[in-house]
Interface confidence: medium
């Protein structure tokens, strides 16, 4: 029996709609800053890429530097959008200037999304300096925000990551230091109860110390996160992304109290250089 | 479908001004970074400069001076030339984008001959 | 200002064979690069962008390579309707914070014996 002549149109319909898709120009990337594009030195600051749904890479490429990041930690935003967040960790001056969103969605890459640029203060806490730009973003139709002089900006809120990290490290040792004292102390009053040890069988066995480099590392976020987006270009080979052949690298960052993790779909990767900061990175491929 | 086209080229005399169109149609200039590009009879692609989507306008730095692009609507680029000498004689191509330019008009012959 | 080195200025080469044009920027402009072809009264046509993308249409004879300052276009399998001047140009796009423009490579002839 031969196919109804409607059913027949529609499907012709869809085909000629999904053949105009494809041919279609993909909509430009927008590119926006959290907490804002003025950041006190030392704080974070993630820049969110924004594109439709389908996407497979992002890049925050760097203006002036030809350097780059790209993502495959995709997460949908709404029905019709997808984003990446590329995040510093804590901002310096060397991460000022101008930034911008690509994607890749095959088979083809976007054109770029307009500048955003950073721009990095030194914290000076007075209640009419803000210390960030609230809300920045770029896309396709806009200029970055220029908020700089807005008064009720928020100042930024929390400790700079070096103190928290001070603040963590004296604690533990404080811990550390009380549960020693209530071993010893719970240990002298079994003395006092029981008499001396008969044998060293009955000794109390030490406390043991738990590993707390491995404990942080195990606890801590896998988001794909950009530290201090190192200054090296990643060659990267385009066609291995349309292939799909992305090899996964885990990258661990080991920065004395700052033990993060981030896992990043890295395509062709090349040699993880440590950055100006001294930042070290240890990189495992995993296949 | 979108398209790209420059105006129609002309004879002028050295020293004269001179402005071409790019008439875009199928996308928004909004949207899109949009260049001139320019070839002497004979010889290679010379870029001029680009207007970006946001207004800003770059120039190679012989261009500088002498040549101004701008938005003139939402569906005109043009490119104003002055000071022209003989070494400007060349067909200008009007073309869309950054990293993907795909779109170029037909081109335009521009002749600088007294 | 970016300047872009092509070579070879003209290359010839048999149906079925392989040509290799080179390309190297002056700076590292990481991986904005295109690569067009340009067939006489005509306008040029983009084969490859950001370095090795295929542009949409064009046949994966047409391999873009390279990062940095260093790219290559290799055409294989030649055709006669290859024989055309090809460029490649830097597509960084300028902004206030560079001056790279966007120049293109003097051009290589390829004709097909």
């Known amino acids: 029996m031969s196919p109804h002549p409607t059913a027949l149109l529609g499907l012709v319909l869809c085909l000629a709609q999904t053949i105009h898709t494809q041919e279609e120009d993909l909509p430009r990337p927008s590119i926006s800053a959290e907490p804002g594009t003025v950041i006190p030195l030392g704080s974070h600051v993630t820049f969110v890429c924004r594109g439709p749904v389908g996407v497979q890479t992002f890049r925050l490429e760097r203006d002036s530097r030809s350097t780059y990041n790209d993502t495959e930690d995709v997460s949908q935003a709404s029905p019709s959008e997808s984003e990446a967040r590329f995040r510093i960790d804590s901002v310096r001056e060397g991460n000022a200037g101008l930034y911008r969103c690509i994607y890749y969605k095959p088979p083809k890459w976007s054109e770029q999304s307009d500048y955003l640029e950073l721009l990095v203060k030194e914290s000076s806490g007075g209640p009419d300096s803000p210390d960030t730009e609230p809300g920045s973003s770029a896309g396709p139709t806009q200029r970055p925000s220029d908020n700089s002089h807005n008064e009720h900006a928020p100042a930024s809120q929390g400790l700079k990551a070096e103190h928290l990290y001070i603040l963590i490290g004296v604690s533990v040792v404080f811990l550390f230091c009380l549960l020693l004292l209530v071993l010893f102390c719970l240990h002298r009053q079994n003395q006092i109860k029981q008499g001396p040890p008969r044998s060293k069988d009955e000794e109390q066995k030490p406390q043991q110390r738990p590993d707390l480099a491995v404990d942080v590392l195990e606890r801590t976020a896998d988001k794909a996160t950009v530290n201090g987006l190192p200054e090296k270009d990643r060659e990267t080979d385009t066609s291995a992304l349309a292939a799909g052949s992305s090899q996964e690298v885990t990258y661990a960052q080991l920065d004395h109290w700052a033990l993060t993790q981030r896992t990043a779909r890295a395509v062709s990767p090349q040699s993880t250089k440590p950055m100006a900061e001294s930042i070290t990175y240890a990189a495992v491929a995993r296949h | 479908s979108s398209s790209v086209e420059e105006s129609e080229g002309r004879l002028v005399t050295p020293g004269t001004p001179l402005t071409l169109t790019c008439t875009v149609s199928?996308?928004?200039?909004?949207?899109?970074?949009m260049g001139w590009v320019r070839q002497a009879p004979g010889e290679g692609l010379e870029w001029i400069g680009t207007?970006?989507?946001?207004?800003?306008t770059y120039y190679a730095s012989w261009a500088k001076g002498r040549f101004t692009i701008s938005k003139t609507s939402s569906t005109t680029v043009d490119l104003m030339m002055t000071s022209l000498t003989t070494e400007d004689t060349a067909t200008y191509f009007c073309?869309?984008?950054?990293?993907?330019?795909?779109?170029w008009g037909p081109g335009t012959l521009v002749t600088i001959s007294s | 200002e970016l300047v872009m080195t092509q070579t070879p200025a003209s290359v010839e080469a048999a149906v079925g064979g392989t040509v290799t044009i080179k390309c190297q920027a002056s700076q590292s402009i990481g991986s904005n690069l295109a690569w067009y072809q340009q067939k006489p009264g005509q306008p040029p046509k983009l084969l490859i962008y950001l370095a090795s993308a295929l542009a949409s249409g064009v046949s994966s004879r047409f391999k873009g390579s390279g990062s940095g300052s260093d790219f290559t276009l290799t055409i294989s399998d030649l055709e006669c309707a290859d024989a055309a001047t090809y460029y490649c140009q830097c597509t960084y796009g300028s902004s206030n914070n560079n001056n790279y423009g966007d120049p293109f490579g003097g051009g290589t002839e390829v004709e097909i014996k």
């Open positions: 207007t970006s989507n946001d207004g800003s």
């Open positions: 073309v869309r984008g950054t990293n993907i330019r795909s779109l």
């Open positions: 199928g996308f928004s200039l909004s949207s899109y970074t």
